[in-house]
Interface confidence: medium
């Protein structure tokens, strides 16, 4: 391979100028042609000067692994995902998080002591003896005798639960 | 580049606490990700046991709720398990890990008198 | 907690053969995380999210499922490779199978 500029890349024994980026090469120069250039479709993107003859596929943000586009792709520069509210990173990917998780809620039994936000966990204190949280979303958590189709029942101090009746 | 460093003793007594700490250079523990410790037992079998999220928040395995704590130093950049009333059956290899991309490399604790 | 069932416990292997190493959960999850773990060494994560490739694994590594059976897929087996496997799953608390090993022929 020919040893090639910086701004070049090879080409057969020859040397091309490089695209620039947000550019594709369309077709490689020639003895009396430069490099054609054409630019990348929506959807797709290349950060640098190259020789690529595609644009790379920008990446997709999947809200199923708790992600959202925190930086929309650009002809020049990939989309970034982050975490989406209520979660957080567990694995990253170069300089970007590729899978998060939902904070933790409540459990029944629980009431939700200070809520989950993009940058603070949930926060969970067990219900009081003869209370209950029927989901563990609840802030307050419920007297027994308030509401005749629940039966608390206990599974130990600050642990009531509930069960249908 | 991230790296996670576990340290404390390696022989502890039946029913004394095991304590153990993670150095992690490269990341800040506030920043972002859960800080987790999993062990693994003789015969690989491996456990999650709890978790410190960068908010200072905990979640636990059920199964050790009663006897697990885990804290951090963030001025130290380090977070710490603490297991009480340990038993020969807490023998293993401890890990300390962020999120599931970057684990330490373990340390060895063997429970016996 | 949900219970992870890998099999087989043990697979042994030719190199260049494919493998399929299969991951079946008591209930079902979001995703599936798989760790390669060689002797003396802490596991490594090698797909997360039922099919993306960790950073510098190699691509003969896959995987696929969905619900509660998931699988991992070495299309060409090499010396390397022999190590035990986990599945992982983290839509709950976290819970790990417990492991198939690769041995090379």
């Known amino acids: 391979l020919p040893s090639c500029k910086e701004d070049e890349y090879p080409v057969g024994s020859e040397c091309c100028p490089k695209c620039g980026p947000g550019f594709h090469v369309r077709q490689a120069c020639g003895e009396q042609t430069g490099t054609v250039c054409e630019p990348c479709s929506p959807g797709t993107y290349i950060a640098h000067f190259n020789g690529l003859s595609k644009c790379l596929q920008c990446q997709m943000c999947d809200p199923a692994m708790g992600l959202r586009t925190s930086r929309n792709c650009s002809t020049t520069a990939n989309a970034l995902c982050g975490c989406s509210p209520g979660h957080f990173c567990i694995i990253q990917d170069g300089d970007h998080c590729a899978a998060c998780r939902a904070y933790a809620t409540s459990s029944p039994g629980q009431r939700v002591q200070k809520g989950g936000t993009e940058s603070q966990d949930t926060l969970c204190q067990n219900c009081p003896p003869g209370t209950f949280s029927s989901n563990g979303t609840l802030e307050e958590c419920q007297h027994g005798t308030k509401c005749s189709k629940w039966l608390v029942t206990e599974a130990g101090p600050g642990t009531s639960s509930f069960r249908w009746v | 580049d991230v790296q996670l460093q576990e340290s404390g003793p390696g022989l502890v007594k039946p029913s004394q606490s095991l304590s153990l700490t993670c150095t992690v250079t490269?990341?800040?523990?506030?920043?972002?990700?859960?800080w987790n410790w999993i062990r693994q037992f003789p015969g690989n079998k491996l456990e999650w046991m709890g978790y410190i999220v960068y908010s200072g928040s905990t979640s636990y395995n059920p199964s050790l709720k009663s006897r697990i704590s885990i804290t951090r130093d963030t001025s130290k950049n380090q977070f710490f398990l603490q297991l009480n009333s340990v038993t020969a059956e807490d023998t293993a290899t401890y890990f300390c890990t962020r999120g599931m991309d970057y684990w330490g490399q373990g340390t060895s604790v063997t429970v016996s008198s | 907690q949900i219970v992870l069932t890998q099999s087989p416990a043990i697979i042994s292997a030719s190199l260049g053969e494919e493998v399929t190493l299969t991951c079946s959960a008591s209930?079902?999850?979001?995703?599936m995380h798989w760790y390669q773990q060689k002797s003396g060494t802490s596991p490594k994560l090698l797909i997360y999210?039922?099919?993306n490739l960790a950073s510098g694994v190699p691509s003969r590594f896959s995987g696929s499922g969905s619900g509660t059976f998931y699988s991992l897929t070495i299309s060409s087996v090499e010396a390397e490779d022999a190590a035990d496997y986990y599945c992982?799953?983290?839509?709950?608390?976290?819970?790990f199978g417990a492991g198939t090993k690769l041995e090379l022929k």
């Open positions: 490269g990341y800040s523990i506030t920043s972002d990700f859960a």
């Open positions: 209930s079902s999850v979001s995703y």
């Open positions: 992982h799953q983290w839509s709950s608390y976290l819970t």
């Open positions: 999210s039922t099919s």
